[in-house]
């Protein structure tokens, strides 16, 4: 008689990012027996949900079911059919919902609903859907790559399992960029946290963590750059914005009210003589640089030292993993590379900036034109966010990795989320048998 | 209490361009979308589309394309209809009527509506 | 597009009457319907919606019921200030449509 392969003894989890500009379905898998052991949960599938972030369904949530389907459909595919009710599936909205609960809980309660009766729909094990904190955010991410780094493991091992993983059991900082909102969380130096909203205290696998963490609202790449154009349009003397963070020759027109819609440009609002006005790209990295940097405000601190608006920032220490829109801006611009210098990826923004429109176009045909025409902002923006912003500086830009995936998951904060709700993290570090690593390492 | 109260009658020749307002107050003008509803004389009601009042995003029946544009002053917590070009056949009232919000299975109902606005297009 | 019929333009009752008023939609719109209620010279009232949920402040003599494709308005005890248009509507998919109307009078 043929052997029967023993039946796969692996649980599965879905963690669902309802995004401000998109939602993305990740499935997690782990052994079972191996619950409690640090980086044994990987990402076997992300499925991207066609359409815009949840928020924007407000007065149209008949059609959040239909939205949901296809990425919801594709877990009932790739999870066995005998782990459906055994699986747990969670939804984190960001900070696109976080936005629309500013203006209406009502209308941030109606999406969240309807968004929990139709994941209840299916075979699963439905959590529920909340909206996530900042500090949650920041701290999941933080979470997520450290644990895929195998930095709460407490054993060194000979080998390193990603090219910038140093053999020491020093967490990496985490810098995460959405597009409205940015989170930044590392653990300082021996330094104390001054304000008390920004500390995070963990006890992961028997050791201590003092987290510092923030996260700006209003200052990911989308809604910074609504701030920014709000901001400029104040001060042009007519319907047309030279906008240098646009390349020569890209035009646009923007209808004043989608300018004011976001709570984000509300300190901009003024009445303007038009109802509608056209950017007119000139593609300058400096004019633009210059122009973001009008949207941090340095000039008042109450802490020993900020990050920008008043937000204690302590000195930055150790290695960073950028990740979500820092690594995908700059994977397009071809700058993720470890060798490539601050310097060199400024004069690397120049260039691209100053490029022309029609030119850009013809050579990435196969890129959308609205995620194109921002590649300038964006790349501009990172490098304006990591430098005035949180202060890293041409040396300490080394420690800077940007990263997409460690060992096949991606970074961000939903892996960590799970773990945190599933219970995987162990304040003390288990109990191992001498064989308990033996399958993975 | 909630109520919505449109502009009044418009008598206006072929060509021409009619802006019908309606102003709502009693509730969170931004929870709920409106409405656009025609009503030819003596005849049935013809749903025109809808407004999203938290987006200012437009939604518009086939038939009411082109000519048509639907806005808002969400300061003024009001809506409005303007059509261009006007021709014999928009000859009627006009009704907004408000998107409102009746949960699973559903979801939506117009519940309020405005008293009508009579437009009668003569050359 | 969803077509609602209602196939009697016109219906004459007497006061304490049980009237029905059909809906039939051209195709399966599940409970997405609502019913109106329109006087001479008046904006449309809301009566029902979900097929069969009464919507605040209407009498209890109005009841919805139907799903898929066939839907009633039932009027149990018939008064003379229901005397009126009554419309049906679907609102299950894009464009929103309203059957042609139903006319209540009295005999």
């Known amino acids: 008689t043929q052997n029967k392969a023993l039946p796969e003894n692996v649980k599965y989890g879905i963690v669902l990012d309802a995004g401000s500009s998109h939602t993305s379905l990740y499935i997690y898998k782990w052994p079972a027996e191996k619950e409690n052991d640090t980086g044994v949960v990987h990402q076997v599938e992300e499925c991207r949900v066609k359409g815009p972030g949840i928020s924007k369904f407000v007065q149209k949530v008949n059609e959040i079911g239909i939205y949901l389907t296809d990425c919801m459909e594709r877990a009932r595919e790739v999870i066995p059919r005998s782990q459906h009710q055994e699986t747990p599936v969670y939804l984190g909205a960001t900070a696109g919902m976080r936005l629309l609960r500013m203006e209406s809980e009502e209308l941030a309660d109606r999406v969240l609903d309807v968004v929990e009766r139709s994941l209840s729909n299916y075979p699963f094990d439905f959590q529920g859907a909340r909206i996530i904190t900042g500090q949650e955010e920041g701290a999941y991410g933080w979470i997520t790559i450290n644990y895929l780094l195998g930095k709460f493991s407490q054993k060194t091992r000979w080998f390193s399992i990603v090219p910038y993983e140093t053999n020491n059991q020093e967490t990496f900082g985490a810098l995460d960029l959405g597009g409205a909102s940015t989170q930044v969380t590392f653990v300082p130096q021996n330094q104390t946290i001054e304000s008390p909203d920004n500390a995070l205290q963990f006890r992961l696998y028997g050791k201590d963590y003092n987290v510092y963490t923030h996260s700006f609202l209003c200052y990911g790449k989308d809604q910074a750059l609504w701030q920014k154009l709000a901001k400029d349009i104040q001060v042009a003397s007519n319907e047309i914005l030279r906008d240098p963070c646009f390349h020569p020759g890209y035009k646009k027109v923007v209808n004043v009210s989608d300018l004011y819609k976001t709570p984000c440009t509300k300190r901009f609002e003024m009445t303007l003589p038009f109802q509608q006005f056209e950017i007119q790209g000139i593609g300058n990295y400096q004019q633009c640089h210059q122009s973001i940097l009008e949207l941090f405000n340095t000039s008042y601190c109450p802490y020993s030292q900020c990050a920008f608006n008043g937000i204690f920032l302590p000195p930055l220490q150790g290695d960073f993993g950028a990740f979500s829109a820092f690594y995908f801006v700059m994977k397009f611009l071809n700058l993720t590379s470890e060798k490539v210098s601050q310097e060199k990826v400024t004069e690397m923004m120049k260039k691209f900036c100053a490029q022309p429109w029609e030119e850009i176009k013809t050579s990435y045909a196969g890129v959308k034109e609205k995620y194109l025409s921002e590649y300038c902002f964006s790349g501009t923006y990172i490098l304006s966010l990591l430098l005035q912003g949180y202060h890293f500086t041409a040396d300490s830009w080394e420690h800077i990795h940007f990263i997409g995936k460690i060992q096949g998951s991606d970074a961000g904060w939903t892996l960590g989320y799970m773990l945190n709700l599933t219970n995987m993290i162990p304040a003390e570090q288990p109990l191992s048998t001498p064989l308990s690593h033996s399958t993975y390492v | 209490q909630i109520q919505l109260v449109q502009s009044g009658p418009e008598l206006k020749k072929p060509g021409e361009t009619v802006k019908i307002s309606c102003e709502a107050s009693?509730?969170?003008?931004?929870?709920?979308?409106m409405n656009w509803v025609k009503q030819a004389p003596g005849k049935g009601l013809k749903w025109m589309g809808w407004i999203n009042t938290y987006t200012g995003e437009p939604t518009y029946a086939d038939d009411f394309k082109g000519r048509f544009a639907f806005s808002l002053e969400t300061s003024a917590n009001t809506a409005y209809l303007q059509i261009n070009n006007l021709k014999n056949e928009d000859t009627a009232t006009y009704f907004c009527?408000?998107?409102?919000?009746?949960?699973?299975?559903?979801?939506?109902?117009?519940?309020?509506w405005g008293q009508g606005t009579s437009v009668t297009v003569s050359s | 597009d969803i077509v609602m019929t209602q196939s009697q333009k016109f219906m004459s009752t007497s006061v304490g009457d049980r009237v029905s008023i059909t809906c039939k939609a051209s195709q399966n719109v599940g409970t997405a319907v609502a019913w109106y209620q329109q006087k001479p010279g008046q904006s449309p009232k809301l009566l029902i919606y979900?097929?069969?949920n009464r919507y605040t402040g209407v009498p209890d003599r109005f009841t919805g019921s139907g799903s898929g494709t066939d839907f009633t308005l039932t009027i149990s005890n018939m008064q003379s200030e229901d005397l009126a248009d009554y419309f049906c509507?679907?609102?299950?998919?894009?464009?929103?449509?309203f059957g042609t109307g139903t006319k209540l009078e009295i005999k």
């Open positions: 979900s097929a069969s």
């Open positions: 009527a408000r998107k409102g919000y009746y949960g699973y299975p559903n979801y939506y109902a117009m519940d309020y």
């Open positions: 009693g509730y969170t003008f931004i929870n709920y979308g």
């Open positions: 509507q679907q609102y299950s998919s894009y464009p929103i449509t």
